[in-house]
């Protein structure tokens, strides 16, 4: 009391910092700093994010919490995970929907859109792979259907349908009947 | 938004006291420090004194230390300043401000007068 | 204590003119250290805090830089209502000290 010599950061414990004459402890995520710390190694005033605001990290000079995001509709996104004081929205595509990048050097924070998956059974295809961060991924056509062209086309039921050479290989056991 | 306003200026002789309040509003006045701070006529600023929100920590230029003394009450949004054994070189205009560090905020001011 | 030596004490200058103060600390301060206006019978007023740092709803022609021992405060295009003493000012360490201003006058 009464002295003039502002301590320098000894505090106890790691989470303090040096903001105007003292050494405060920061607040912590999900929390904004109001006022910082009035004495040595005191703790600053920090209040709750409002709603649809967050701080991710503890911190020491954020006055004010980061806006949610909002998925963008136009680009089919929804919320996986509302936001939180703590975490920001976490957007991403429906079941049967992919991630389309927007930009060739995709990474986390990147612009998106969804895009619907291919559904294998509705070109009569075998699904290889499931679709999630990309798209479905088919195989070869389905049993009673043969390659012709670019799509999968069904057996024919009698003699009558022609036949050419895939189809035959394919479907041959149905020329029996 | 923000408002100090000091009173308790006047003239005074050597030797004699005065007590100088600043009323704060607007504001969360127990979350913040604050300070005096004083200017004497056609001089510069000097930094006088600072008080923690809970007022449990003071600080003092040496040219006042002993003399005079600051105090709050956070019932009253109040923040006071008690001056002693004024001398003829406490002349001056006295803020108080808010802050510890930067003084975001600043009173207009009340004149305070040692003359004999 | 901590000095703080601004410079010059005073100067004149055109309107659109390009102006620049500095302050000199007795020892290193970091970036702790705030720029204030006052003009004449008011209370300063806060322009910049940690040397750089713009106050809300200050003009941007305002601007400060520096670090350690060396700062500089400048106005990048100078108005009628620019008239004022600037003062710095040191909050790394107590006692806070100021700089003895520099006064301001138009040519």
């Known amino acids: 009391q009464g002295g003039t010599r502002s301590p320098r950061c000894d505090c106890a414990g790691d989470f303090h910092k040096k903001i105007g004459l003292f050494c405060c402890r920061g607040c912590p995520a999900g929390h904004y700093l109001k006022a910082p710390c009035t004495e040595p190694c005191g703790n600053s005033t920090c209040l709750v994010c409002p709603q649809d605001t967050f701080l991710a990290w503890e911190n020491h000079h954020n006055s004010e919490c980061a806006r949610c995001q909002a998925c963008d509709e136009q680009a089919s996104q929804v919320a996986l995970e509302n936001c939180s004081a703590v975490a920001d929205t976490r957007c991403g595509c429906k079941p049967g929907w992919f991630v389309e990048c927007q930009v060739s050097q995709c990474v986390s924070s990147s612009p998106f859109y969804c895009q619907p998956c291919l559904d294998c059974g509705a070109l009569h295809r075998h699904t290889r792979l499931l679709c999630s961060r990309r798209d479905t991924d088919c195989g070869t056509c389905l049993p009673g259907f043969y390659e012709h062209g670019d799509g999968c086309v069904s057996c024919p039921t009698s003699t009558l349908g022609s036949c050419p050479e895939r189809c035959a290989a394919v479907c041959g056991w149905r020329q029996m009947f | 938004e923000v408002q100090l306003v000091e009173s308790g200026g006047g003239s005074v002789q050597p030797g004699g006291s005065l007590r100088l309040s600043c009323a704060a509003s607007?504001?969360?006045?127990?979350?913040?420090?604050m300070n005096w701070i004083r200017q004497a006529p056609g001089k510069g600023l000097e930094w006088i004194t600072y008080?923690?929100?809970?007022?449990?920590?003071?600080y003092y230029a040496d040219s006042v230390k002993g003399r005079f003394t600051i105090s709050r009450d956070n019932a009253k949004n109040s923040l006071y300043l008690q001056m002693n054994s004024l001398r003829a070189e406490d002349t001056a205009v006295y803020y108080c401000?808010?802050?510890?560090?930067?003084?975001?905020?600043w009173g207009q001011g009340t004149l305070v007068t040692v003359s004999s | 204590d901590i000095v703080m030596t601004q410079s010059p004490s005073s100067l004149s200058a055109s309107v659109g003119d390009r102006v620049t103060i500095t302050c000199q600390a007795s020892q290193d301060i970091s970036n702790y250290l705030s720029w204030y206006q006052q003009k004449p019978g008011k209370a300063p007023k806060l322009l910049i805090n940690?040397?750089?740092n713009l106050e809300t709803g200050v003009p941007s022609r305002f601007s400060g830089s520096g670090s350690g021992t060396d700062f500089t405060f400048t106005i990048s295009s100078l108005q009628p209502e620019d008239i004022a003493t600037y003062y710095c000012?040191?909050?790394?360490?107590?006692?806070?000290?100021f700089g003895q201003g520099t006064r301001l006058e138009i040519k």
């Open positions: 940690d040397a750089s």
């Open positions: 008080i923690s929100s809970s007022g449990g920590h003071t």
């Open positions: 000012q040191q909050y790394d360490n107590l006692p806070i000290t």
């Open positions: 607007g504001f969360t006045f127990s979350s913040y420090g």
């Open positions: 401000a808010r802050g510890q560090g930067p003084f975001e905020y």
